[in-house]
Amino acid sequence: GSMKVLQEPTCVSDYMSISTCEWKMGGPTNCSAELRLLYQLVFQSSETHTCVPENNGGVGCVCHLLMDDVVSMDNYTLDLWAGQQLLWKGSFKPSEHVKPRAPGNLTVHTNVSDTVLLTWSNPYPPDNYLYNDLTYAVNIWSENDPAYSRIHNVTYLKPTLRIPASTLKSGISYRARVRAWAQHYNTTWSEWSPSTKWYNSYREPFEQHHHHHH
């Protein structure tokens, strides 16, 4: 029988070089063998490019479209083919569907006695428009204390967060992860960065003093 698209492709752009399109088929599909997503910039003399999708679960497919860079006027036509059968036709304006790249290199610095310093890297180069527009959310939680989970919103440009060590329990491990969004581009949140684990060994001065005399 003929193949059918159950859930039409939806695409997001990283506003740099890649747009990711996901969709669901009506039944189990070998996406890379059976399907092709053709995309073409609607502009003078632009050629059609082919994306070979990958499986994303039994009926899901995902395709990573290379787009060099993106400007606000860019618009792409999308054609999903199964051999000679056109399954779906649509269009996609990357600037209107932006999902930033995830921040990287999340590091926890505990060498400052009373502060936990978290730093991470902006996922964009300085010449990208999103570079100076990203704000972040840092999620800190503890596997030892399941009740503890906090989100810290970082609304300034510098990719750092300082937390007083005294606000965390001593003698247990914590994890942190960070994600980004760009307010002026009305983006969705990025994926979370890989998490980083650290051990909070900080003790209050009076607690140390008390400990010392007993």
Partner: antibody, heavy 119, light 107 residues
């Protein structure tokens, strides 16, 4: 690092022919439109021709249409400009340039090759 | 063809000066306006594309603005290496066309 190296320039008589080449490296050549831009001695810049990433589309300035042919070899990562029926006014430094996705700007340029048309 | 009129054709300025160059298109070019820098005997270099986007590796003292038919290149604080000729170019419609150039000289 993107590198574009032109060759094939030289002195040619009016009515003669010349073939310019541009060897590209440092990027996926087959993904980008490529162009030729020229500059007559002491003058401004003039767009000559553009070819799409796969070679399906070619566009020319009116001043060279019917005389010049742009082509590319995506296996050899090389851009060409075949110039026939050359005129004195074609004398210029010819630059090959790489576009972005839109082929609206010339993002990277070669060092240029001088073509002199004179009897 | 779209005509690109650049002004001034030349200007003299000192290191540290703020310099502005304008480019007017004969019709709306929908922000597809690019700026190049060229030094004698060298190939042009792309500075700004799509009106205001800084090309990779270009110092932030260069900026672009404009819309419709009128566009501007600004150098916020002129440096010794900025003395050169600057060209605008429209990419909205074939044939692609350049402005006549602006030569920035040392005062």
């Amino acid at each position: 690092e993107v590198q574009l190296v032109e060759s094939g320039g030289g002195l040619v008589k009016p009515g003669g022919s010349l073939r310019l080449s541009c060897a590209a490296s440092g990027f996926t050549f087959s993904r980008y439109a490529m162009s030729w831009v020229r500059q007559a001695p002491g003058k401004g810049l003039e767009w000559v021709s553009t070819i799409s990433s796969g070679g399906s589309y070619t566009n020319y300035a009116d001043s060279v249409k019917g005389r010049f042919t742009i082509s590319r070899d995506n296996v050899k990562n090389t851009l060409y400009l075949q110039m026939n029926s050359l005129r004195a006014e074609d004398t210029a430094v010819y630059y090959c340039a790489r576009a972005t996705a839109r082929a609206t700007e010339f993002a990277y340029w070669g060092q240029g090759t001088l073509v002199t048309v004179s009897s | 063809d779209i005509q690109m009129t650049q002004s001034p054709s030349s200007l003299s300025a000192s290191v540290g000066d703020r310099v502005t160059i304008t480019c007017q298109a004969s019709q709306d070019i929908s922000n597809y306006l690019n700026w190049y820098q060229q030094k004698p005997g060298k190939a042009p270099k792309l500075l700004i594309y799509y009106t205001s986007r800084l090309h990779s590796g270009v110092p932030s003292r260069f900026s672009g603005s404009g819309s419709g038919t009128d566009y501007t290149l600004t150098i916020s604080s002129l440096q010794p290496e900025d003395f050169a000729t600057y060209f605008c170019q429209q990419g909205n419609t074939l044939p692609l066309t350049f402005g006549g150039g602006t030569k920035v000289e040392i005062k």
